[in-house]
Amino acid sequence: IWELKKDVYVVELDWYPDAPGEMVVLTCDTPEEDGITWTLDQSSEVLGSGKTLTIQVKEFGDAGQYTCHKGGEVLSHSLLLLHKKEDGIWSTDILKDQKEPKNKTFLRCEAKNYSGRFTCWWLTTISTDLTFSVKSSRGSSDPQGVTCGAATLSAERVRGDNKEYEYSVECQEDSACPAAEESLPIEVMVDAVHKLKYENYTSSFFIRDIIKPDPPKNLQLKPLKNSRQVEVSWEYPDTWSTPHSYFSLTFCVQVQGKSKREKKDRVFTDKTSATVICRKNASISVRAQDRYYSSSWSEWASVPCS
Amino acid sequence: RAVPGGSSPAWTQCQQLSQKLCTLAWSAHPLVGHMDLREEGDEETTNDVPHIQCGDGCDPQGLRDNSQFCLQRIHQGLIFYEKLLGSDIFTGEPSLLPDSPVGQLHASLLGLSQLLQPEGHHWETQQIPSLSPSQPWQRLLLRFKILRSLQAFVAVAARVFAHGAATLSP
C-alpha cells in the first residue's frame, strides 16, 4: 500500500481467483484514543472500533472511503483504491491502446518545435467518475523539472456504438535548451482513477522524436506567363523554432488530381517556393519536416489549382 | 578552417557535408520507429558518447559570441563516432551488406572532422570506450543504438553549420 495523495491510498493486488489479497491497517488521524468507530462509504454498519482498523483487501467491495467517527463526529477519511496485477502485468483497463506507432501505446505526445513544450493525449471510452493526474521530468535518476498543466477533455468522437473521449495535457520543460542534443529522455507519468480503480501509464521520449511542425502558412500560387507551370510559395509556420537559419525545415510539394487514383507528382525542396505543373481540377499541397532529423511530417497545407 | 588558433571554418563546405551526414545516418538506420532502443536496457553502451550540451555554445548566440567551443565539441564527436564505425562493432559479424551506407557514413565523418581540424593541429579527443560485444545479436543492437545516437548528434552539427554558413561566413 502507498499514498497517492493526502488521505488517498493505493493497494496493489495480485488479481486471480481466490487470491489472498492484502492486509491493510488504517489509522485514524486524531489525538483521540477511545470511542472511535469505523464505517465504509455511505454505510452506517460499524466495521470495527479503536484507533486502527485492520482489513483484508481482496476485491473492489473492500475498497472505498473508510471513515473514523467519534460520537457522530467525523474524525478522518482514508480512500482506498485498487491497482490490479494480472499474470504479473498491471491492468490497463481505463485507457485505450492507440496501437500507433506500436501496440501498447496508451499515451501519444507531440511537439510543434524545440522549445520544450509538448502535448500528450490519450483515449478512453469511460465518461464518468474519471480523474487524471500528470507528472513529467527529464530523466528519472536525477530528474529535471517539467511542468504539466491539468488534463482536459479535448475531443469526443463516436466510434461505432461507443463514444470515445480524448484527454490531453500540455507540459513545458522548465529549463529547455532547444539547441542542445538531448541525452536524457522526457518521462511522462499519468495516474488514472476510475471509481475505485487506479492505473498508471508512462511514456518516455526525446523531444526530437515527437516533433511535428505545424503546416506551412501563406501557401500561394503565381501562374507563370505562357505556361502551365505555377510558382508555389509558402512560409515557415509561426510556431516553428527560430532562427530559421538554425532550425531549418524541408518541404514536400504534391500535385494531386481530384481522383485519389490519379498519379501524385511530388517535389522535395529546402526552399520556400517551387515550380510545378498545375493540372485542371488538381490541388497543390505542401508539408514540412525538420531538415536534419526525420521526425514526423506536418499535416498538408493545400490550395486548389484553379 | 576551425583551427585551435580560432580562425573560421569553411562554413559552406561544412554545411554541405553535415547535411549529407544526416541523410546517410538515416539511410543507414531508417527503421528507427520500429524498435524502442531505450527499452532494451544496456544503457552503459551509449552513455559514454559525447553529446552537444547546453553549455557547449552551439546555440545561435553562442556561435555568434565564439564558435570555437562548439566546433571543438563537434570535432570530438565526429572523431568518436568515426572510431566507433570503424570498430569491430560494425566490421564484425553479422557482416554489413556490401551496399550499406555505413561505409560512406564512416568516410564522411572523417571528411568533416578533417575540414574542422587540418593536419598538424590537435584538439584533445575523447577516449572511445572499449565495447566488444560477444554475441552477434548484441552487436546488432549496439549498431542500432550508435546510429540512433549519431542521428541526433549530426542533426545538431548540421544546424550549427547551416546557421554558420548563413550568418557567420565572411
Epitope: A151, D238, T242 | -
Partner: antibody, heavy 120, light 107 residues
C-alpha cells in the same frame, strides 16, 4: 494580420468585480499562450497572468493571486480576465498579449488596452 | 521572483546618436529576455526577443546582446520616431518581470 481587441473595462467600486475580454483574430488562437499585462497611470508595465494554449495551466502575479482568474474559450477565439475583490491599486490599463515565437514567453503582439478604474 | 533593473532610468539624446540601455536580472535568465518600446497612450511593441533576435518589421538600427544576467539594447542611429520609453522583460520563468523602464527624450 494579428489583432487583439480588449473590452470590459470601466469604473468599479472597491470590492467590486469586472470581466475583461480579449477577442483575437488573424492567427490560430488555440495554438498560442496568452497573457494579461497592466500599466497603472504614469507607471511601468506589470505582468498579471498567463494561460497556456490548451487552458490547462495558468499563472498569476502575487498581487492578484486568489482574486483574478484567467481563462480562454478557444472555440470563440477569446481570452478572459475575471477580476474580483478589486482594489484602488488595480487601477490600470489592461493589455492582452499573445506569446511568441516557437513557444517562447516573449509577448509578441499586444492589444490597445482597456482602462479599469477602481474608485469610490 | 527575478528582479529586473534598468539603467539609465532616463536619458537625453539627439537624432543620429548611438544609444545604449542596459538591463540586469537578479538571477540568470539565459537568453530569455525581450526589449519593448512604448510611446505615450500606445501599447508596447516588441523590438527584440531571445536577447538578440530582431522582431520582424523592426529597423536594423535596433540590436540586442547579452546573456545570463546582463543585457544591452543598442540604437545605432537614433531617429525622431525612436523617442519613447524602453522596457526589458524576462520570460525565463514565472512570474514574468519587466524592468522599470528607460525614457529616451530629446536633448
Amino acid at each position: 494580420e494579428v489583432q487583439l481587441l480588449e473590452s470590459g473595462g470601466g469604473l468599479v467600486q472597491p470590492g467590486g468585480s469586472l470581466r475583461l475580454s480579449c477577442a483575437a483574430s488573424g492567427f490560430t488562437f488555440s495554438g498560442y499562450d496568452m497573457s494579461w499585462v497592466r500599466q497603472a497611470p504614469g507607471k511601468g508595465l506589470e505582468w498579471v497572468s498567463s494561460i497556456w494554449s490548451s487552458g490547462g495551466y495558468t499563472k498569476y502575479a502575487d498581487s492578484v493571486k486568489g482574486r483574478f482568474t484567467i481563462s480562454r474559450d478557444n472555440s470563440k477565439n477569446t481570452l478572459y480576465l475575471q477580476m474580483n475583490s478589486l482594489r484602488a491599486e488595480d487601477t490600470a490599463v489592461y493589455y492582452c498579449a499573445r506569446q511568441g515565437v516557437g513557444g517562447s514567453g516573449s509577448l509578441l503582439y499586444w492589444g490597445q488596452g482597456t482602462l479599469v478604474t477602481v474608485s469610490s | 521572483d527575478i528582479q529586473m533593473t534598468q539603467s539609465p532610468s532616463s536619458l537625453s539624446a539627439s537624432v543620429g546618436d548611438r544609444v545604449t540601455i542596459t538591463c540586469r536580472s537578479s538571477q540568470g535568465v539565459r537568453y530569455d529576455l525581450g526589449w519593448y518600446q512604448q510611446k505615450p497612450g500606445k501599447a508596447p511593441k516588441l523590438l527584440i526577443y531571445g536577447a538578440f533576435n530582431l522582431q520582424g518589421g523592426v529597423p536594423s538600427r535596433f540590436s540586442g546582446s547579452g546573456s545570463g544576467t546582463d543585457f544591452t539594447l543598442t540604437i545605432s542611429g537614433l531617429q525622431p520616431e525612436d523617442f519613447a520609453t524602453y522596457y526589458c522583460l524576462q520570460d525565463f520563468q514565472y512570474p514574468f518581470t519587466f524592468g522599470p523602464g528607460t525614457k529616451v527624450d530629446v536633448k
